[in-house]
């Protein structure tokens, strides 16, 4: 969380941001507020990029001003036009790359005066894990697979039984590149699986955390997944 | 070349499948958003799926349940999945790009036609 | 869902006459995510315009494209025989994700 004051004369405004994470492949938000301003045409809005001349987008007097726009951002960019009344300037990006990652600018004039704040916008993959049970093995194993994650992530497993122990000797993990050469596909196996037990395989680089829950017993198998954004 | 190649239309009677295929030569379908886009015989154009760059798909609510968007990144192929085929999909079907510039590649069209 | 109405319906034109087509959304379009088509009978789309104003690859540049928020424009300086089309504004972003007009028929007077 990054809080921005501008000072112009005797007026100032908030500007808050939130360190944002950007899935590669998707749209992503950086997120930025403001102090809310009724004059709508009287809000300017300025994204900007770290080592880019140009703008990454401007909306003033109610609308878009792409004419400083630079071309790495063009086509791909939107603030969310409705909400800017009420102190909303994030902005929408499409098709997130892992070079859109840096150091972004908001920056805000009302009014009421003016602001700018950081934002640090992190770029990488990440995907819910998916754990099966592996009938095909010698014994009992669990299958833990993520489709894409970047940068590599670490794996480990834990369980509800034997809380604090170490799986690593039991278990075995691999990553395989996709074909889009980026981003790659996480399979961790965990050997010699007990019977009414939950087992967990978190998954976890610097932008994401995932884990995969899966309980087996005679009768059933029940699984939970959740994906968590760091930093943000 | 950029290029985009559909195939697998044809005609089928209601409540029946089909699955279509776009064939893409010159980029690499998993970088890009891809979508089918369809136009009813006399009409406008319609949008019907998007697969995104991360794998994850998205349909018009006309379809939704009943189509299915994917694709074979080793085979650099879109396909569509069509279950439960209506009188109202009757259309040709668009496999397009959007390169963050619009849809900006597009093939030549399938056509589907469902009659009994 | 945001619904582009593109009006006129039908155009009927001379060539060598400037062409002004209309798209209106019925709320606000980021001007990066709005686009332009040409289709020609038995053929697929082409892309005219993106990001509201920019010309796409090979579009020459008596085709050009203006506007923000709810009305855009796609204006065609001098008619040229092959420019007779059906021309289709489309908008990206909102459900469903992509949103095209109806179309406005460009034909010979």
């Known amino acids: 969380l990054i809080i921005g004051f501008g000072i112009s004369g005797k007026h100032f405004i908030t500007v808050t941001t939130f360190t944002s994470a950007g899935n590669i492949g998707e749209d992503g938000t950086l997120s930025c507020t403001f102090e809310p301003d009724i004059k709508l045409n009287g809000i300017v809005i300025q994204w900007l990029k770290e080592g880019i001349k140009g703008l990454v987008h401007e909306f003033k007097e109610g609308k878009d001003d792409l004419s400083q726009q630079h071309e790495m951002f063009r086509g791909r960019t939107a603030v969310f036009a409705d909400q800017v009344v009420v102190g909303n300037a994030s902005l929408r990006l499409k098709n997130v790359q892992l070079t859109d990652a840096g150091t972004y600018t908001c920056y805000i004039r009302t009014s009421k005066g003016k602001g700018n704040a950081n934002l640090e916008y992190k770029t990488g993959a990440f995907s819910m894990p998916e754990i099966n049970v592996d009938y095909n093995a010698s014994s009992e194993s669990l299958r833990c697979e993520a489709p894409r994650w970047f940068p590599q992530p670490t794996v480990a497993w834990a369980s509800q039984v034997d809380q604090g122990a170490n799986f690593s000797e039991v278990s075995n993990t691999s990553f395989e590149l996709n074909s889009e050469n980026v981003t790659m596909k996480v399979v961790s196996v965990l050997y010699n699986v007990t019977i009414n037990n939950t087992y967990s395989c978190m998954i976890e680089n610097d932008i994401a955390k995932a884990t995969g829950d899966i309980k087996v017993t005679d009768s059933e198998v029940k699984r939970r997944s959740q994906l968590q954004l760091l930093n943000s | 070349e950029v290029q985009l190649v559909e195939s697998g239309g044809g005609l089928i009677q209601p409540g029946g499948s089909l699955r279509l295929s776009c064939a893409a030569s010159g980029f690499i379908v998993s970088r890009n958003y891809m979508n089918w886009v369809r136009q009813a015989p006399g009409k406008g154009l319609e949008w019907v799926s998007v697969?995104?760059?991360?794998?994850?798909?998205d349909s018009a609510d006309s379809v939704k349940g009943r189509f299915t968007i994917s694709r074979d990144n080793s085979k650099n192929t879109l396909y569509l999945q069509m279950n439960s085929l209506r009188a109202e999909d009757t259309a040709v079907y668009y496999c397009?790009?959007?390169?963050?510039?619009?849809?900006?590649?597009w093939g030549q069209g399938t056509t589907v036609t469902v009659s009994s | 869902e945001i619904v582009l109405t593109q009006s006129p319906g039908t155009l009927s034109l001379s060539p060598g006459e400037r062409a002004t087509l209309s798209c209106r959304a019925s709320?606000?379009?980021?001007?990066?995510?709005l686009a332009w088509y040409q289709q020609k009978p038995g053929q697929a789309p082409r892309l005219l315009i993106y990001g509201a104003s920019s010309r796409a690859t090979g579009i020459p540049d008596r085709f050009s494209g203006s506007g923000s928020g709810t009305d855009f424009t796609l204006t065609i300086s001098r008619l040229e025989p092959e420019d007779f089309a059906v021309y289709y504004c489309q908008q990206y972003g909102s459900s469903p994700l992509y949103t095209f007009g109806q179309g406005t028929k460009l034909e010979i007077k």
């Open positions: 709320q606000s379009v980021s001007s990066s995510y």
């Open positions: 397009a790009r959007d390169a963050d510039y619009g849809l900006d590649v």
């Open positions: 697969i995104y760059g991360s794998g994850r798909t």
